[in-house]
Interface confidence: low
């Protein structure tokens, strides 16, 4: 059968499963004269044979783990044994079967974890190897916790990353682990090949001993410090402690106070450095930070609360040098005249600020003493004995003692006896007509003057007039100020006028006295006036519904995908045209009519996220006014960056000759987002031919060790290719090269004769 199993001499590749006894030939090569026989060379390992007539076969089972690819050459010879065709490469790829079990690198692991460590943060890695092909399920390892001892309430405190073997705390473990209750745990971990998915997978187990260490980095209890302390300062008030010696402590004042009266020493003891004043500040909240020797925070800051305790260090104070009240003639007994409200700066609702009021003197004592009384705790003055007559005594002066538990203060009250309030205010006009204003009239403008008069005693509460707008201005756009000498009212604009919501307002004013009217007298129509405010339109710019619009898309969205939209409205109802400003990367376009935003180019989170542009809304027609808002596009990460070396590793060297196998450590990174747990790269040699000389082993998710397998290296540079896989979705792989020089050394450095100084390696192993 020409074609599948026979044919002319040409480069060919065959795939054969390992571990299977030969059951058929590989290929029958046909000779073209003058060729008469065939010869096989290369990596035959005494397994591959070609008969003189061109029949290529193998004589025993292959082992991929011994050699994954056999590079053979076949040549055609003439009758004299001279090559007349070829040699051509024949590649035998050995396909993997699951004939190796995974094995843990250690039969027992030991680790420690601090209580309250962050859940999901690895504190220990277990590592197993399987000689089968990692690109197939045969070599894909799956880690599992078989048992946790002890197991409390059936709750797992530990978890393992099935792929990487990283052991971390669960949320429950972070919250509940307590070395005082249980200082150590044992985990039995299994590893299975076939990705853990097959009944026929091989497995291995290992034991992990975990010590739980106490986390003493805890916020101390809130501190209470008495104000105005006379003890020598600084005074230790509390302390924090990092878990290990050598931390550098500092305090952070989040409030940025002009005077920050606290300090911390290098033991973590916290001091108050000067007396505190509760009346200046009654509580402090600040943070204690622990940093390592490089100034990097070791953990989250701790919140320190200091409450300043009050002492009675403030006397009562009067509201003003003299407090003036008015009382109408003929007011009835018990009527309230007014309330004296003294103050005390000490802590509210405590004995230190609880005030008592007492009248200590009344002058004149006409027609008798004791005309007034004051409520002991409320400070309210009342008429005690009889109605007053202005013609007898127009004014009384009271001295009132106000006291807290330690201090007394005298306050003075003047009580003016005034005419009875039997006259109502009367507007000079009942209708102030129409007023037309543009909607952009300035706030604070006086737009109208109104006037009412009151025939009661001048310059008393009976004749003083207060104006209120009682109708037509529910938004509170207008207000009325009164001139106390003339009782003239000035109507002013307090909030912007708005044609769109209130083009016409029918305003009603009421004029009234601060003093109550005497019994039987009521306000009537004379105390009311009206006024009509007409607001004219001013063309205004469109208004966006938000100051900032935000949208979130994956960085790999197809070109033309809608990524967001913005909306604006024109107060006058005109149509709006949308445009973009500041699209520096040329990634976006906006639909002028709808405000929908689309991608017009490939997006890239690594170039910067969020991507910020401005959106402009412009009136169509009218005066083309416009306004601007922000559009922020948050780009979500896609695994689109292959791993690479974290830094430049030129200059790695070993001193030649090697006295023992050596190793070096390198670090990988990639530009994708690695939330919480960081990258988890896997490392392997970049080509099979390197495996005799080199070995690569993973240290953690970002670092690996490259080791020599022997000491027989030439004195030259070797370029070691390393394959780094990021295990992402989809997984991306980078092949990087580590140049390693073997060189003669003088005092631990590469020796180069004068004139050969270029490219001297700088890192010795």
């Amino acid at each position: 059968q020409e074609g599948k199993f026979s044919g002319p001499l040409k480069p060919m590749t065959f795939s054969i499963y390992e571990g299977q006894e030969p059951s058929q030939i590989i290929f029958q090569f046909k000779a073209n004269p003058p060729a008469v026989t065939f010869e096989l060379t290369g990596e035959t390992d005494n397994i591959f044979v070609i008969e003189r007539e061109g029949l290529l076969y193998y004589n025993r089972a292959l082992d991929r783990e011994t050699r994954s690819t056999h590079n053979l050459q076949v040549a055609a010879l003439d009758a004299n044994g001279i090559i007349v065709e070829g040699p051509v490469p024949i590649t035998i790829k050995v396909k993997d079967i699951n004939d190796n079990r995974p094995t843990f690198l250690q039969s027992k692991y030991e680790g420690s974890v601090r209580q309250n460590s962050r859940p999901g943060k690895p504190f220990l890695y277990v590592n197993a190897t399987d000689l089968d092909d990692p690109a197939t399920p045969n070599g894909q390892l799956y880690y599992q916790i078989v048992i946790q001892l002890p197991m409390i309430n059936n709750v797992m405190y530990f978890q393992i990353n099935n792929k990487t073997g990283a052991i971390s705390l669960t949320r429950e473990g972070s919250q509940e682990l307590n070395p005082a209750k249980n200082p150590s745990y044992n985990l039995v971990i299994s590893v299975k090949d076939m990705g853990g998915q097959s009944e026929n997978s091989f497995s291995d187990t290992t034991s992990v001993d975990i010590i739980v260490t106490e986390n003493i980095w805890k916020a101390p209890k809130p501190v209470e410090m008495v104000e105005n302390s006379t003890d020598p300062h600084p005074i230790k008030i509390t302390q924090v402690r990092w878990n290990d010696p050598g931390a550098q402590y500092s305090l952070v004042d989040k409030e940025k106070l002009p005077r920050f009266p606290f300090s911390i020493d290098q033991e973590g003891d916290i001091y108050v450095t000067q007396p505190l004043d509760r009346e200046e500040k009654d509580a402090y909240v600040f943070y204690a930070v622990a940093k390592d020797e490089y100034g990097k925070p070791l953990s989250y800051p701790l919140e320190i609360h200091v409450k300043v305790k009050d002492i009675n260090d403030n006397p009562p104070t009067c509201p003003s040098p003299v407090t003036v009240f008015e009382v109408q003639e003929n007011e009835r007994l018990g009527n309230s005249i007014g309330t004296l409200t003294a103050h005390d700066r000490d802590e509210e609702n405590t004995a230190n600020s609880f005030l008592n009021y007492r009248i200590v003197e009344q002058t004149p004592k006409l027609p008798m003493d004791g005309l007034f009384l004051i409520q002991t705790y409320a400070g309210m003055l009342q008429l005690a004995k009889q109605s007053l007559k202005k013609q007898d005594t127009p004014q009384y002066n009271l001295t009132i003692e106000v006291s807290d538990k330690d201090f007394k203060t005298l306050c003075f009250v003047q009580i003016n006896v005034i005419d009875i309030n039997d006259q109502i205010p009367i507007f000079e006009k009942s209708d102030y007509g129409n007023l037309t204003l543009a909607e952009d009239t300035n706030i604070g403008s006086t737009i109208l003057t109104i006037q009412a008069t009151d025939a009661d005693e001048p310059f008393t509460g009976s004749s003083k007039i207060l104006y209120h707008i009682i109708k037509g201005d529910s938004e509170g756009r207008l207000g009325v100020d009164t001139d106390p000498h003339t009782n003239t009212g000035y109507v002013i604009i307090k909030k912007p006028l708005d044609f769109e919501t209130a083009a016409v307002s029918n305003i009603v004013f009421k004029a009234e006295n601060p003093e109550p009217l005497v019994f039987g007298v009521k306000y009537n129509a004379s105390s009311f006036a009206k006024f009509t405010l007409i607001v004219t339109d001013v063309n205004e710019a469109p208004q966006f519904s938000q100051h900032v619009f935000q949208a979130k898309v994956s960085e790999d969205v197809a070109i033309g995908t809608k990524v967001g939209n913005v909306t604006a409205k024109d107060p006058e109802g005109l149509d709006i045209s949308y445009s973009l400003r500041g699209d520096t990367r040329g990634w976006l376009k906006i639909d002028h009519v709808t405000g929908e935003i689309f991608s017009v180019a490939p997006l890239d989170r690594e170039a910067g996220s969020p991507y910020r542009v401005q959106v402009v809304a412009t009136e169509v027609g009218g005066s083309s006014l416009s306004s601007v808002s922000e559009f922020h596009l948050i780009l979500m990460d896609v695994n689109d960056n292959p791993p690479r070396l974290a830094k430049d590793y030129t200059g790695l060297f070993f001193c030649h000759p090697l006295s023992a196998p050596g190793s070096l450590i390198f670090e990988a990174t990639d530009d994708d987002q690695h939330l919480f747990r960081g990258p988890h790269f896997t490392f392997s040699l970049g080509s099979g031919s390197l495996q005799n000389d080199w070995e690569v082993s993973k240290i953690n998710g970002t670092h690996a060790r490259l080791s020599t397998r022997h000491t027989e290296f030439e004195e030259r540079e070797y370029v070691v290719l390393i394959r780094i896989n990021d295990g992402g979705r989809p997984p991306l792989e980078g092949i990087v090269s580590l140049p390693v020089t073997f060189c003669s050394c003088v005092e631990g450095s590469c020796f180069r004769p004068a004139g050969h100084q270029t490219g001297i390696p700088t890192v010795g192993m």
């Epitope: 027992k108 030991e110 420690s112 601090r114 260490t213 878990n243 290990d244």
Partner: nanobody, 115 residues
Framework: EVQLVESGGGLVQAGGTLRLSCAAS????????LGWYRQAPGNQRELVAN???????SYADSVKGRFTISRDNAKNTVFLQMNNLKPEDTAVYYC?????????WGQGTQVTVSS
């Protein structure tokens, strides 16, 4: 409360022998890696000998062949047998459980080797 109490230090002639003991309480002793560290005046604390919970041992180069670390899990005690002592072995010797970075420390015992 965790406590590590060292004993067995003292003054000895060069070439002599001492056996240090460290009794532990308050910890699950058999689960801890145990170590002896020392600190001479003006120097940093350095590891002398270490033994993992599995029984693997390691020693500082300067004491290899002369010092031996051992442990008795039943008695919650770790030992350091010091033979052929030299003047440069003079230091305060500290017992440690759980490692220098995260573990627990004893108060230390003085070892003085005179020439």
């Amino acid at each position: 409360e965790v406590q590590l109490v060292e004993s067995g230090g003292g003054l000895v002639q060069a070439g002599g022998t001492l056996r240090l003991s460290c009794a532990a309480s308050g910890i699950r002793f058999s689960f801890y890696a145990l170590g002896w560290y020392r600190q001479a005046p003006g120097n940093q604390r350095e590891l002398v000998a270490n033994m993992t919970s599995g029984g693997s041992t390691s020693y500082a180069d300067s004491v290899k062949g002369r010092f031996t670390i051992s442990r008795d899990n039943a008695k919650n005690t770790v030992f350091l047998q010091m033979n052929n002592l030299k003047p440069e072995d003079t230091a305060v010797y500290y017992c440690n459980a759980g490692g220098a970075r995260l573990g627990y420390w004893g108060q230390g015992t003085q070892v003085t080797v005179s020439s």
